[in-house]
Interface confidence: medium
């Protein structure tokens, strides 16, 4: 476009800027070691240090590990972002009794209101159930909290919570069958055997039934409870949440009890091929500064279960310089892929191929 020439010319001779044809404007060139936070940075504050996956840039400008939510009594509330840690909270049916930075050190099961009492305030991830005396017209046999919610005044006794600790856990607090064993497992989290991290564990075809809170006789408030990184689908089956562990993806919404995690392309990339709750193929914004572009290579490792599709090269983009070396500095046009998990096989010898689910749980790979 001839009308763009004056704008383009203003970039030439200014080593701190380059011209971006896609947005038709001058962009600030991030110094070596810094990464653009947007497609066309305008000023130094639009550049930042880049951290590896599962790390975030803290206030002191250091890459710091995001907290993990791998204990089975925790779920991810907000994902690990470039400038903030992952946040964990107690999973449904539990509340936090001892908080920790971005997480909870100790979760307890929501208590069940005893006979003659009804739920005034249902338990949340932060607070236990609050009970109050039942109205005279309400039958004490009405055990289901959902069916017993009637406004009433009076004192509000706090029901005694069921702690998640070896001393107080008991199998009677919830059904124990299938692969879940949540009552005992939740109890064992603080004393877990060193080589059995909760994020790498038992494949389970039947995750079992667990209530949102311990389920009294006659209660309708029992739903199937899935293991971490699984959700209850419309058919009532525990289904693995999608994984955003490919590093051209970021988590948009976390894995919840009734909905999958959703992934989207990370900043600086757009989705070329969509997939359920995710993107099968992210490509960099189609912009290139000829002197700084690295042509993305195909990632093809045929014997692995998770295979990142090849990244498309963009129009008007020059390939890597003759020697093929990627420079140690970055430019606004390079993809934001860091350490993407295209290959996910456990470092253990097995006779059958073993792959990892989004949780890192081994699953036999039939293919």
């Amino acid at each position: 476009f001839p009308q763009d020439r004056p704008f383009e010319d203003t970039c030439h001779g200014n080593p701190s800027h380059y011209y971006d044809k896609a947005v038709r404007r001058c962009c600030y060139r991030c110094p070596m070691g810094l990464f653009p936070t947007q497609q066309c940075p305008q000023r130094p504050t639009d550049c930042r240090k880049q951290c590896e996956p599962d790390y975030y840039l803290d206030e002191a400008d250091r890459c710091t590990a995001c907290v993990t939510c791998s204990r089975d009594d925790l779920v991810e509330k907000t994902p690990c972002a470039w400038n903030s840690s992952r946040v964990c909270e107690c999973r449904p049916g539990m509340f936090c009794s001892t908080s920790a930075v971005n997480s909870c050190a100790r979760c307890f099961f929501h208590s069940v209101c005893p006979a003659g009492m009804i739920v005034k305030f249902p338990g949340t991830a932060q607070k236990n159930t609050v009970c109050e005396p039942a109205s005279p017209g309400v039958s004490p046999a009405c055990a289901s909290p959902e069916n017993c919610k009637e406004p009433s005044s009076g004192t509000i006794p706090q029901a005694k919570p069921t702690p998640v600790s070896p001393a107080t856990s008991s199998a009677s607090t919830m059904p124990v069958r299938g692969g879940t064993r949540l009552a005992q497992e939740a109890a064992s989290k603080l004393t877990r055997a060193p080589d059995s991290p909760s994020s790498v564990g038992r494949p389970s075809s039947d995750p079992g039934l667990s209530p949102t809170q311990p389920c009294p006789e006659g209660s309708g408030d029992c739903r199937k409870q899935c293991e971490p990184d699984y959700y209850l689908d419309e058919a009532g089956r525990c289904t693995a949440c999608v994984s955003c562990s490919r590093d051209d993806l970021v988590e948009k919404t976390p894995c919840a009890w009734n909905s999958s995690r959703t992934c989207e392309c990370r900043p600086g990339m757009i989705c070329a091929t969509s997939a359920t709750n995710s993107c099968a193929r992210c490509v960099p914004y189609p912009i290139c500064a000829a002197e700084t572009v690295t042509k993305p290579q195909d990632m093809a490792e045929k014997d692995t279960t998770f295979e990142a599709p090849p990244l498309g090269t963009q129009p008007d983009c020059n390939p890597t310089p003759e020697n093929g070396e990627a420079p140690a500095s970055t430019s606004p046009t390079q993809s934001l892929l860091v350490d993407s998990q295209a290959s996910k096989t456990l470092p253990i010898p097995t006779s059958a191929p073993v792959a990892l689910s989004s949780t890192g749980k081994p699953v036999l790979d039939a293919g």
């Epitope: 890459c63 710091t64 993990t68 790498v200 990627a326 500095s329 390079q334 892929l337 470092p347």
Partner: antibody, heavy 123, light 107 residues
Framework: EVQLQESGGGLVQPGGSLRLSCAAS????????IHWVRQAPGKGLEWVSY????????DYNQNFKGRFTTSANKSKNTAYLQMNSLRAEDTAVYYC????????????????WGQGTLVTVSS | DIELTQSPSSLSASVGDRVTITCKAS??????VAWYQQKPGKAPKVLIY???YRYSGVPSRFSGSGSGTDFTLTISSLQPEDFATYYC?????????FGQGTKLEIK
């Protein structure tokens, strides 16, 4: 099988330069960051730098920023550590290592290491 | 930078002994600590990650514990092949740092 092999070490005079190579095999090179860790004779381990072969992004221990530069050649599955203005105290075995991919979280501990290459800075 | 201080710097023990090595961080590192074993002329080998999780193939006599600032590597019953130097590493915050090492020698 994941394998990392360093080369390029040797004797160099103070103020001189050297480029170390780390040839990777057994995994998709662009999938993992490659780190450099060094160990002076009879001393402990010291993290130097890492390179993301996919984007070319690097980060450094402040002690080495400016003198050391990491790069990668994706077509050769090789990472490099360019060391300039070498001093006697840079004498060490230099290892390249690959970060973990284990379980749900991807943190930077090292299950895979090369055998190391010795760099001696002496006049 | 986060400093890791290992103690003792060296110790002598016999086959069958129970040995404990500690690693103290200068600030909270959560459970983001790994332990390595290194033999002369060889690269380090990871034993423990996330403070207490044994890496695949590591014998069960090795165990790790701790969180925050204090971490421990325990070898429950020393075997001849365990005589080596042990390092802790924090991967909580960059730059990544290692302890100065603990040399385990035969008594």
């Amino acid at each position: 099988e994941v394998q990392l092999q360093e080369s390029g070490g040797g004797l160099v005079q103070p103020g001189g330069s050297l480029r170390l190579s780390c040839a990777a095999s057994g995994f998709t090179f662009t999938t993992y960051t490659i780190h450099w860790v060094r160990q002076a004779p009879g001393k402990g381990l010291e993290w130097v730098s890492y390179i993301n072969p996919s984007s070319g992004y690097s980060d450094y221990n402040q002690n080495f920023k400016g003198r050391f530069t990491t790069s990668a050649n994706k077509s050769k599955n090789t990472a490099y550590l360019q060391m300039n203005s070498l001093r006697a105290e840079d004498t060490a075995v230099y290892y390249c290592a690959r970060r973990a991919d284990y379980g749900n979280y991807k943190y930077t501990w090292f299950p895979y290491w090369g055998q190391g290459t010795l760099v001696t800075v002496s006049s | 930078d986060i400093e890791l201080t290992q103690s003792p710097s060296s110790l002598s023990a016999s086959v069958g002994d129970r040995v404990t090595i500690t690693c103290k961080a200068s600030q909270n590192v959560g459970t983001n600590v790994a332990w390595y074993q290194q033999k002369p002329g060889k690269a380090p080998k990871v034993l423990i990650y996330s403070a207490s999780y044994r890496y695949s193939g590591v014998p069960s006599r090795f165990s790790g514990s701790g969180s925050g600032t204090d971490f421990t590597l325990t070898i429950s019953s020393l075997q001849p092949e365990d005589f080596a130097t042990y390092y802790c590493q924090q991967y909580h915050t960059y730059p990544l740092t290692f302890g100065q090492g603990t040399k385990l020698e035969i008594k």
